[in-house]
Interface confidence: medium
């Protein structure tokens, strides 16, 4: 038989025995001559190197390019393929020789002890046990142990071939520790060598690359990529890498098995690719493929190689961020750069440091955004190598849903005298300002809070029949004034007022404010009484340590038994917007107070005096009077607020400034405190006196120096003082330029 591709110029070597298969007896001599057209060599079984002592290869005496192979006294082990070939080509002629040796029908392997067969537990896979025969037509079976089992060729999936060995589905012998072939000749049994069965796995669970993504390097740096394959037990792995610059001289590949915990159902293999100094041509996709023979899994990552350090903002970097109070705000610094830049955040020019409310890193995170977080945030990226800086400004706008200032004054609201004109107010703070404030009303009796009616926190009113104030049929005549805008506590607020032209009917009024991020509402209980009337003397909110009198005036012909009470500290729980139980129905919550009675021609006046009012005196005061005829009780409630004494503070700072001669300087100094502080100005620690050039306005809040002169230069101090102390701020005014000579000089 001939193998290899025919060549244009060469014929195949010619063998002296023109057969594919030759059968000879043991102990005889095998001699085959091979002739050709150039240098020849022989290969024979068991020894592919040509160093076997018994085998003799000689040059023919009768011609060039001719060699004879001789084996005297052949044995069964000499069975196999004999090949004559041209050196350094694929052109060859082969003959298969059977040496019939009935004493050893199986050809022994080179190592005469045992062999190893590797199998997988795959139903579809077969395994070949290489027990080759020196006789072609033997009856061969396969023995597996332990427990012992015998497998006989079935003409289908189990077979024996003298040239190949015993073929059997691998799962049939996967239980076994060892197998061997057995042949019966004339009732004698002959056994091949033992083969140890090794069950190998093939499943690869995953292949992981590390780093897995975002690999960036600069020219000359070292790239190290680790590829880890996790497999079932008894698996062998071959790694294969694909990368952009395959001809890299600094490339290094190291493969090794990783230790896993004992009892683990898994094996780990690691392949490490190292390129010592990357170049631009190393940029690209790196793929690691792990193969177990039956299965291949791969993973890829992109490696970016930069020519030089750089930093830039990514296209997705925001310039405006909008948020609502209380939300968590995240402003990521989106950048492109190598190496990763240092990131610094500034707010209105001041560096931001991380704390429990704000995290200033790759992402600026404000945990619970508040109004004061509104402003311009600058992020500065610095390339740590080149020191190149890039900056970007992000404007943060914080929206505030409508907040109604008076809503915090939850109390059994004041009663209103029958027939009087009253103004109800809702002061709304919202960002952006509310796009509308609407008023609604309903009759008090339609919504009486009777004990029998269940009132929940979420729905404090048993009835929700709110009517628009335009429809005041059956109620009080109403007029809604145009919204006013006022600066209150340094905030721009919207004030909506509802004027009740004549207080005839007890009702509930609701104002509702809406802006783009939410809504707010306030319910006002407008209780109309024909009973007593409360006034406050002096008519203002007292400050701590001031004296105040509460006057209760009632018509003597109608009322008797005037009494002052204070509402206890823990009345029935009142929820936001909930209507309280009428105080006259619940005297248990009242504390009786000492008061002085005065009378004039028509009225009784009961005066309750508070000397040196304290914060503890705040609360709801009730005047109770009894109808002389019906004996029905009438209650009027008045809320008293005592303002806390606050030491002076000055908001804002005076700035040092430089001005040219002849120009004007205008500065303001806003002070707060209770009692309100007096503001005074000093220059170089001496009281500043008003003259034609120095003007003080708005209770000394604003200082104007007109047509400044050189002598106006100096240290200016604004001082705000009250009985509780002083606060001051200072600034240095520098006056530049030469003084012009006047005609007088």
């Amino acid at each position: 038989a001939s193998v290899g591709l025919p060549s244009v110029s060469l014929d195949l070597p010619r063998l002296s025995i023109q057969k594919d298969i030759l059968t000879i007896k043991a102990n005889t001599t095998l001699q085959i001559t091979c002739r050709g057209q150039r240098d020849l060599d022989w290969l024979w079984p068991n020894n592919q190197s040509g160093s076997e002592q018994r085998v003799e290869v000689t040059e023919c005496s009768d011609g060039l390019f001719c060699k004879t192979l001789t084996i005297p006294k052949v044995i069964g082990n000499d069975t196999g393929a004999y090949k004559c070939f041209y050196r350094e080509t694929d052109l060859a002629s082969v003959i298969y020789v059977y040496v019939q040796d009935y004493r050893s029908p199986f050809i022994a392997s080179v190592s005469d002890q045992h062999g190893v067969v590797y199998i997988t537990e795959n139903k579809n896979k077969t395994v070949v046990i290489p027990c080759l025969g020196s006789i072609s037509n033997l009856n061969v079976s396969l023995c597996a142990r332990y427990p012992e089992k015998r497998f006989v060729p079935d003409g289908n999936r189990i077979s024996w071939d003298s040239k190949k060995g015993f073929t059997i589905p691998s799962y049939m012998i996967s239980y076994a520790g060892m197998v061997f072939c057995e042949a019966k000749i004339n009732d004698e049994s002959y056994q091949s060598i033992m083969y140890i069965v090794v069950v190998v796995g093939y499943r690869i669970y995953d292949v992981v690359l590390s780093p897995s993504h975002g690999i960036e390097l600069s020219v000359g740096e070292k790239l190290v990529l680790n590829c880890t394959a996790r497999t079932e037990l008894n698996v062998g792995i071959d790694f294969n890498w694909e990368y952009p610059s395959s001809k890299h001289q600094h490339k290094k590949l190291v493969n090794r098995d990783l230790k896993t915990q004992s009892g683990s159902e898994m094996k780990k293999f690691l392949s490490t690719l190292t390129i010592d100094g990357v170049t631009r041509s190393d940029q690209g996709l790196y793929t690691c493929a792990a193969s177990s023979g039956l299965m291949t899994k791969k993973n890829s990552t992109f490696v970016r190689v930069h020519e030089k350090p750089f930093v830039a903002f990514g296209s997705g970097m925001e310039s405006l961020v909008e948020a609502t109070v209380g939300e968590r705000v995240r402003i990521p610094a989106k950048y492109l750069g190598y190496p990763p830049p240092e990131i610094k955040w500034y707010k209105n020019g001041i560096p931001l440091e991380s704390n429990h409310t704000i995290k200033a890193g790759h992402v600026l995170t404000i945990m619970e955004v508040s109004e004061r977080d509104t402003g311009n945030y600058t992020v500065i990226l610095t390339n740590p190598i080149s020191k190149e800086k890039q900056s970007h400004v992000v404007s943060l706008v914080v929206y505030v849903p409508p907040q109604i200032g008076e809503k915090s004054l939850i109390s059994p609201v004041d009663s209103y005298q029958y027939g009087t004109t009253q103004t109800l107010t809702c002061t709304v703070y919202a960002i952006p300002p509310p796009h509308h404030i609407h008023w609604y009303w309903q009759l008090e009796e339609e919504c009486a809070n009777e004990p029998s009616q269940a009132v929940s926190v979420t729905n404090p009113y048993p009835c929700e029949e709110w009517r628009s104030v335009e429809d005041f049929q059956g109620g009080n005549k109403i007029e809604v004034n145009k919204n006013q805008f006022a600066l209150i506590e340094g905030k721009n607020k919207t004030v909506s007022t509802l004027v009740i032209q004549a207080a005839n009917v007890s009702a509930l009024y609701k104002c509702e404010a809406v802006n783009k991020v939410g809504r707010g509402e306030r319910v006002i209980s407008f209780h109309v009484t024909r009973g007593p009337e409360i006034t406050l003397q002096p008519d203002m909110q007292p400050t701590e340590q001031e004296s105040v009198s509460l006057w209760c005036t009632a018509d003597r012909s109608t009322f008797e038994n005037l009494t002052w009470y204070k509402l206890g500290p823990q009345p029935l729980p009142i929820h936001v917007g909930e209507l309280p139980t009428p105080v006259c129905k619940n005297l248990d919550t009242l504390w009786k107070l000492n008061a002085t009675m005065f009378s004039n021609s028509t009225n009784d006046i009961l005066i309750m005096e508070l000397k040196n009012a304290s914060l503890q005196d705040q609360g709801d005061y009730v005047c109770l009077a009894q109808d002389r005829k019906t004996k029905k009780r009438h209650c009027v409630v008045r809320q008293l607020t005592v303002l806390e004494r606050v030491a002076p503070t000055i908001t804002g700072n005076l700035e040092n400034q430089t001005t040219s001669i002849g120009e004007s300087i205008e500065v303001s100094c806003t002070a707060s405190g209770n009692p309100p502080p007096q503001i005074m100005w000093f220059k170089d620690n001496e009281t500043l006196v008003e003259d034609s050039g120095i003007v003080l306005k708005d209770g000394n809040r604003n200082l104007t120096i007109r047509r400044v002169r050189k002598e106006d230069e100096g240290l200016y101090t604004c001082q705000a003082c009250s009985v509780l102390g002083c606060a001051k701020v200072e600034a240095f005014f520098i006056i530049e330029g030469a003084q012009e000579k006047t005609n007088l000089e």
């Epitope: 600069s218 000359g220 740096e221 070292k222 240092e342 990131i343 740590p384």
Partner: antibody, heavy 126, light 110 residues
């Protein structure tokens, strides 16, 4: 741990040039910047310039602009500082120093001379 | 003339706390981090504080740094005789595109 090893002391005449070397051993040359800093007798530390070996780019202090050349040989992991038109005021100890490149706190980059050479004394005298 | 300003000398007795100040401008300390170096004559300078207030491993916690606006300070508590040395502050300057040092402060332990 990387070490910076500098060449030995030099004595030079005014108007001549000096070339001091600084070899990095025991670490990756990588993308660290290497600066040169000098200290004249009785004076403080003075920064001269820096080179980023991996990119071969250098920048110099204005005081030395045009007189100093800082180069790097990537194959031998060696930096060189050459100062020309020497004058007696250039008598000083010349140091090479590595700018560290470690991250810390997630967003801040540690920027400091964490490894210094042992120094090279250059004397300029007629 | 050094770009960063340091007092030429400082002193203290053993156990005392000493503070060395370093003043700069918005282009250096104002926009970059400050480092402090310890220098003994005849040896290479050694990094003492980096990134305003961070200590490299091996530097005792007696040394602390801080920065506010365009100035920085180095505080040494529990002063020891071994602390006698020159101390330098340094920062990157964006305008000069380079490192700038202070003139150095010679610390004497009395």
């Amino acid at each position: 741990q990387m070490q910076l090893v500098q060449s030995g002391a030099e004595v030079k005449k005014p108007g001549s040039s000096v070339k001091v070397s600084c070899e990095a051993s025991g670490g990756t040359f990588s993308s660290f910047a290497i600066s040169w800093v000098r200290q004249a007798p009785g004076q403080g530390l003075e920064w001269m310039g820096r080179v980023i070996p991996v990119f071969g780019t250098a920048n110099y202090a204005q005081t030395f602009q045009g007189r100093v050349t800082i180069t790097a040989d990537k194959s031998t992991s060696t930096m060189f500082m050459e100062l020309s038109s020497l004058r007696s005021e250039d008598t000083a100890v010349y140091y090479c120093a590595r700018e560290s490149g470690d991250y810390y706190d997630g967003s801040r980059y540690v920027d400091a001379f964490d490894i210094w050479g042992q120094g090279t004394m250059v004397t300029v005298s007629s | 003339q050094p770009v960063l300003t340091q007092p030429p000398s400082a002193s203290g007795t053993p156990g005392q706390r000493v503070t060395i100040f370093c003043s700069g401008s918005t282009s250096n300390i104002g926009s970059n981090t400050v480092n402090w170096y310890h220098h003994l004559p005849g040896t290479a300078p050694k990094l003492l504080i980096y990134s305003n207030n961070q200590r490299p491993s091996g530097v005792p916690d007696r040394f602390s740094g801080s920065k506010s606006g365009t100035s920085a300070s180095l505080a040494i508590s529990g002063l020891q005789s071994a602390d006698e040395a020159d101390y330098y502050c340094a920062a990157w300057d964006d305008n000069l595109n380079g490192w700038v040092f202070g003139g150095g402060t010679k610390l004497t332990v009395l």
